[in-house]
Each structure stands twice: as C-alpha cells, then as structure tokens.
C-alpha cells in the first residue's frame, strides 16, 4: 500500500507549488523502509556496490558538471542548475567557458577554468581548504572540496558568490538519489539536507541512507556485517 | 514591438496616495521582471525597486519601503505602483522600465506626480 | 549600498570630438554597469549593459570598458544628438545605484 502527502512546497524558482510524497507503506504496520535500513535490515546496496545505483551517481554527476549557478535577476537568490532550467530573461546563469573563467592559479594566469560556476563556493575566496600550491582544485566542478572556511568579505564582485544561496544538496530515498532542492522541500520529501555542501558530487548518499557505521570509502558500500545483524 | 504605456500626471494632496499604471505589449509580461525608478526635476535617477510579474516577488530600495507598493495583474499585463502618504518629496516623474539581463532596456514614457495642496 | 561616482558632471565638447565619462563604484561590482542616454523630458535609453555590450539599434560611436569598480564610458565623434545626459548604473546588487549623471553640452 503507498501513503500519498500533499503540500504546497517552496521549490528552487522560489515559487510554491503543490508536491506529493509517496511513501510505501510497512505491511505488518511497522517502520518505513528507510528506518529498516538504518536498523541493519538486508539491503544489498549498503553490503555491496550496486550497479544501478552507481550508474545513477554517475548520470547525476555528469549533469552537475555541466551546471553554473542561476541567479534570480529580483534579488530572489540563486541556486545550482543546468541552463535548460534557468530562465533567460529572469535570471543570469553564471557559468564560466572560453576565458570567462578565473585562472587556475593565481600565479599562472595563462590556464582558464571552463568547470563552475558554482553558487557559494569559488577557489578564489575559500580560504579552507585553500586552493593553491599542490593542492590546486581540479577544473572539475564535481572534484572540488566542502569549502569549510570563507574568505571574510560581505561582497566578492562575483555574482554567484554575493547571491542569497536557495538550494543545497538533498539525499532522496532508499536509491541514495541526490537533488539541489530548497530545505523545506527536501524535509517534506524525508530527505537529508547537507547545510554545509554546495554539490550532490561533495556528499555521499547512500552513505547517509544505510547508516549504521560509516562506509571506509565513502563510494563503496562495506557493511557485510548486515548478514548478521538481521 | 515592446511598449510600456504608463497612466497620465497626477496632482495629489499630501497625506494621500497615488497609483501608477504601467501597460506591456509587444512581448510575454511574465517572462521580465518590471523596475520602477524615481526621477525628480532636474535632478538624477533613483531605483525604486523590482517585481516579478510571474510569481508576484517584489524587492524594494529600502528608502522605498513603506513609501511604494508594487504588484502586477498577469491577465491585463500590467504592473502597478501605489505611492502612499505622499508629501512634496514625492514629487517626481516615475519610470517603470522592463529588465534585461539586470539592465532596463525598455521604459515607459514616465508619470508625473505632482503632491501640493 | 553601493554608490557610484561619476564625473564630471559636465562637459563641453564640440561636433566630431570625443568624450570620456567615468564611474567609480564604491565597492567591486564585475563587469555589471549599465550606460543610458537621457534627453531633455524623455525616458533613459539603454546604450550599454554588462559594461562593454552595446544594447540593440545603439551607434557604435558608443562604448564602454572596464570592470571592478573603475568604468568608462567613451563617444568618439560626437553628433548634434549626443549632447544629452548620460548615467552610469551599477546593476550587480540592490539596491541597483546610478551614478550622478554627466551633461554634454555643445562648445
């Protein structure tokens, strides 16, 4: 049986829209699936790498590395997503190409990043981890660090950086799917929402769905243990 | 072609309050954002403020806040712009002009406002 | 808020001559300036959005550089029409800011 949950939601375009949480219902009148999972129950994603789901990872990552940030041109705020969902004429979709893009390295000007931009985070103004040295980032969006430390300036001169940041990561089902949503539509969908990320590519979904004891490499699922504590 | 038809002048007594009226044509209303600016006589030009036709999200210049109040009717495409508690200060000539690309790159022909009692 | 200075605030310049008008922002804004041509009891008119990018239909004898907070405004050989008022316009934050305005008056 499914439980069905409507509600008028705040999405990323800032608009509420009416959106609908289907949950599977227990059978035997008990938990949810998800809360069965955290409990130790026998699901094969958590023991093992599940095909499907890695092809899923792998699909939502390709897509992200070809998103920028849209800023919405009413001051609304901004929020990570492809072009095709950025309006042309309401918002600005920062997205570096060409030579619009900052150097790679502040002391080699000749190499332009074509990967961002991404809203609140930029190698120019995190300052942890620092993007210099050997420890350059990558010109792929999908490789870059949780920035934990901000360069302390309230304007940057970036557009994507001074925006009113709308949407952030948000792990979706038992599948470990990930979206770039507002906070209340990922607490109405029983998501987990990641405060402290800018990308689906920085957290680790399945991770956090299966629970338990935390995977030694946050890609490969490791919890064999399962067999025995169902 | 694009239009922004704006509502004729206005003498008005202090105290009171005025609405100003700006018609689209030529183009899809909710697809722009519309801006209001301030223009005194003889002096420069002041931001008002934005409205978002499409899901009604207005931002205001904070010196503007209490003073203008904007909203748009999708079925008539048109934007309008309320001024209350008007005094002398308020006398201006006011602009509604269509965003794009953050700049304004089409303007009504401006409504005057004249507040004297 | 971000305030913009232009100057100057006017300038006698004769047919066929060139002109610069400058805008400093108080604070960086990128390339995010827009340049308009007022006439006498007129509406602005766009010239110049995202600070070099001539708007639709505008002569290209109107130009624009610079980013930061250091722009510049530039009509080289000017024609009886362009002696008008100009205005700068930071459109990177709100509330968007205009510069004071430069009037070109004819030598």
């Known amino acids: 049986a499914q439980h069905v949950t409507t509600q008028l939601v705040l999405r990323n375009k800032g608009v509420y829209e009416s959106v609908k949480y289907i949950q599977q219902e227990n059978f035997w009148i008990g938990p949810s699936s998800i809360d069965l999972i955290h409990l130790g129950a026998k699901f094969s994603p958590c023991i093992r790498k599940d095909q499907q789901i890695e092809q899923l990872v792998l699909r939502e990552r390709d897509l992200e590395r070809d998103s920028g940030c849209c800023v919405q041109n009413d001051h609304s705020g901004c929020i990570q997503t492809q072009r095709k969902d950025c309006s042309e004429t309401l918002a600005t979709f920062v997205k570096w190409q060409d030579d619009t893009g900052p150097p790679m390295d502040k002391s080699d000007l000749g190499q332009k990043r074509t990967s961002g931009a991404v809203c609140h985070q930029d190698p120019r103004t995190c300052e942890e981890p620092a993007s210099s040295g050997a420890h350059i980032w990558p010109d792929d969006i999908t490789k870059w660090p949780i920035c934990t430390e901000q360069a302390k300036s309230n304007r940057t001169g970036f557009l994507h950086m001074d925006c009113q940041i709308k949407g952030r990561p948000c792990c979706i089902s038992t599948k470990g799917s990930c979206e770039i949503t507002t906070r209340e539509y990922c607490e109405f969908m029983h998501g987990y929402f990641h405060e402290e990320a800018t990308l689906c590519s920085q957290v680790h979904c399945l991770d956090k769905v299966c629970g338990l004891l935390p995977f030694l490499n946050p890609e490969v699922p490791d919890q064999f243990y399962r067999l025995w504590l169902s | 072609q694009v239009q922004l038809q704006q509502s004729g002048a206005e003498l008005v007594r202090p105290g009171t309050s005025v609405k100003v009226s700006c018609k689209a044509s030529g183009y899809a209303f909710t697809n722009y954002l519309i801006e209001w600016v301030k223009q005194r006589p003889g002096q420069g030009l002041e931001w008002i403020g934005v409205i978002n036709p499409g899901s009604g999200f207005t931002n205001y210049n904070e010196k503007f806040k209490g003073k203008a109040i904007l909203n748009a009717d999708k079925s008539s495409s048109t934007a309008y712009m309320q001024l209350i508690s008007l005094t002398s200060e308020d006398s201006a000539v006011y602009f509604c002009?269509?965003?794009?690309?953050?700049?304004?790159?089409?303007w009504g022909q401006g409504t005057s406002v004249t507040v004297s009692s | 808020d971000i305030q913009m200075t232009q100057s100057p605030a006017s300038q006698s310049a004769s047919l066929g001559e060139s002109v610069t008008i400058t805008c400093l922002a108080s604070?960086?804004?990128?390339?995010?300036l827009a340049w308009y041509q007022q006439k006498p009891g007129k509406s602005p008119q766009l010239l110049i959005h995202a600070a070099t990018s001539l708007a639709d239909g505008v002569p290209s004898r109107f130009s624009g550089s610079g980013s930061g907070t250091k722009f510049s405004f530039k009509i080289s050989s000017l024609q009886a029409e362009d002696f008008v008022s100009y205005y700068c316009?930071?459109?990177?934050?709100?509330?968007?800011?205009f510069g004071g305005g430069t009037k070109l008056e004819i030598k």
């Open positions: 002009a269509r965003d794009l690309k953050r700049a304004m790159d089409h």
């Open positions: 316009q930071q459109i990177y934050s709100s509330p968007y800011t």
């Open positions: 604070q960086t804004i990128g390339t995010w």
